[in-house]
């Protein structure tokens, strides 16, 4: 709390301008009316105030808006945003995408801070869903944003927003998240033709079920190994050798390099060795000829 002292004669601020950078903390407190600050907020960011001076200005705004800043003030916070706590931000009601962009710009180049996370949370909750424009904006600033959301939060993403997602936005998503996103992507891209569809859906295939992979294997898509390695193990296991060969096309040769890694390792263990031998890749570990394969999981389900 800045000590209350009278403003020295002639120092009362009539405008928010550059001259204020020479004011000591107590002078800012005494000589800058909160009402003046509120009307001319857009000037604050253009003036190189020190962090200590920004503390004084924040204190004035906090006092002026005990229930949280209005959007007309929030959109002009600029570097003052870095002074806000998540508790401050939880009081806000941010509805304008322009306001969100302005504040994200202040934090650009830094990791997502608790303040930014709270701001985004307030914004998305206010909108009710992650619409395309919002997703576009958030992933532009934070490519990993989508993968930072819980499956529950991702469920509020409408299929139409999936068009805004770039492959790099999904790099850090885990299977649980892709399970939610894949059906939305499938719906969003359903009217595209085969090759175009595959280009768009490829990044989401970590959430695809077996039947969709089987369908893709009939379309000469030539899936690369990197994509194949991200597929759900439980979705890959039921695929036949012929289906995997069709799915990967010329990339099938890459299976040899990945034979010790999931899901390739687990898939190999489920195939007959003589089927694997037809690939001519020297893949080992399949079921020897003459062995009967019992699906124990099916047996348990029946008993």
């Amino acid at each position: 709390e800045v000590e209350k002292t009278a403003c020295p004669s002639g120092k009362k601020a009539r405008e928010i301008d550059e001259s204020l950078i020479f004011y000591k903390k107590w002078e800012l407190e005494a000589c800058v009316d909160a009402a003046l600050l509120a009307t001319q907020m857009d000037r604050v960011n253009a003036i190189p105030f020190t962090y200590e001076q920004l503390d004084v200005l924040k204190h004035k705004l906090d006092e002026l808006y005990p229930q949280g800043y209005p959007e007309s003030v929030i959109q002009h916070l600029g570097y003052l945003f870095l002074k806000m706590s998540p508790e401050d931000i939880r009081k806000w009601n941010v509805t304008s995408l322009e306001t969100l962009k302005a504040l994200l710009e202040v934090n650009k180049g830094h990791e997502m801070s608790p303040q930014v996370a709270t701001l985004i949370d307030r914004f998305v909750k206010g909108r009710g869903q992650l619409d395309k424009d919002t997703l576009d904006t958030l992933t532009a600033f934070y490519p990993g944003y989508l993968c930072s959301l819980s499956p529950e939060e991702l469920s509020s993403v409408p299929p139409s927003s999936i068009w805004a997602v770039r492959p790099q936005d999904l790099d850090t998503c885990d299977p649980r998240q892709l399970d939610v996103l894949y059906p939305k992507a499938r719906l969003a891209f359903q009217n595209m033709n085969g090759s175009e569809y595959f280009v768009k859906i490829q990044s989401f295939l970590g959430g695809a079920p077996t039947e969709d992979l089987k369908a893709l294997s009939q379309q000469n898509v030539s899936m690369d190994l990197a994509t194949f390695m991200k597929l759900r193990t439980d979705a890959v296991l039921p695929l036949t050798v012929a289906e995997v060969q069709k799915l990967l096309g010329p990339h099938v040769e890459g299976l040899k390099a990945e034979e010790r890694h999931r899901p390739v390792r687990d898939w190999i263990l489920r195939q007959r060795q003589d089927d694997l031998d037809t690939l001519g890749l020297g893949l080992q570990g399949g079921i020897p000829n003459g062995y009967l394969v019992l699906d124990l999981s099916m047996q348990e389900a029946l008993s």
Partner: antibody, heavy 119, light 114 residues
């Protein structure tokens, strides 16, 4: 001396619109939010809305949205309130009031403009 | 919106007497971060516009006589005039300015001189 000088009384017909002015002097007009307050029957005070003279930004009491429109002319340090589609319910004294220095109390008031809506 | 209730609606006192009037808000006007109450008192003399007397519940506006005192916290507030003068004949209003920008006024207390 800080002063707010309001325009004179008005007698208007129902359905008409009218504009009240409030000329500020003695302080930096763009540094303080201007508010408008309605007083009906010589008693109840109701906050109508505010305007930021610096950038023209406005906020209205939900009750007066569509009824009042606030504007400013920075060059003459004058705030205006236009009242639309007047009815007898709008007969009242209307005040402009400057917001206080440290918060949203009103430290300077105009003398008021009496509006009478009658056919 | 916060509802402000003033009582009594009117009272008559003799010159020199002490007078108190009450203002209650439907929710607390105390902001815990600065321990300030967002309440103002105004005086409106007959035929005049309102005049600010008190802000922050207890801070007298410059030029206001010290016989006027504001007190209270949270939801209950009082304006006291320690020794009434004939010129204090007026209606007194309280106003909350806690909820930006939906500020509300009380219905007023009319002070009459016997």
């Amino acid at each position: 001396e800080v002063q707010l000088q309001q325009s004179g009384p008005e007698l208007v017909k129902p359905g008409a619109s009218m504009k009240i002015s409030c000329k500020a002097s003695g302080y930096s007009f763009t540094g303080y939010t201007m508010n408008w307050v309605k007083q009906s029957h010589g008693k109840n005070l109701e906050w109508i809305g505010l305007i930021n003279p610096y950038n023209g930004g406005t906020s209205y009491n939900q009750k007066f949205k569509g009824k009042a429109t606030l504007t400013v002319d920075k060059s003459s340090s004058t705030a205006y309130m236009e009242l639309l589609s007047l009815t007898s319910e709008d007969s009242a004294v209307y005040y402009c009031a400057r917001v206080g220095g440290s918060s949203w109390y009103f430290d300077v008031w105009g003398a008021g403009t009496t509006v009478t809506v009658s056919s | 919106d916060i509802v402000m209730t003033q009582s009594p609606s009117s009272l008559a006192v003799s010159v020199g007497e002490k007078v108190t009037m009450s203002c209650k808000s439907s929710q607390s006007l105390l902001y815990s971060s600065n321990q300030k109450n967002y309440l103002a008192w105004y005086q409106q003399k007959p035929g005049q516009s309102p005049k600010l007397l008190i802000y922050w519940a207890s801070t007298r506006e410059s030029g206001v006589p010290d016989r006027f005192t504001g007190s209270g916290s949270g939801t209950d507030f009082t304006l006291t005039i320690s020794s009434v003068k004939a010129e204090d004949l007026a209606v007194y209003y309280c106003q909350q300015y806690y909820t930006y920008p939906t500020w509300t006024f009380g219905g007023g207390t009319k002070l009459e001189i016997k």
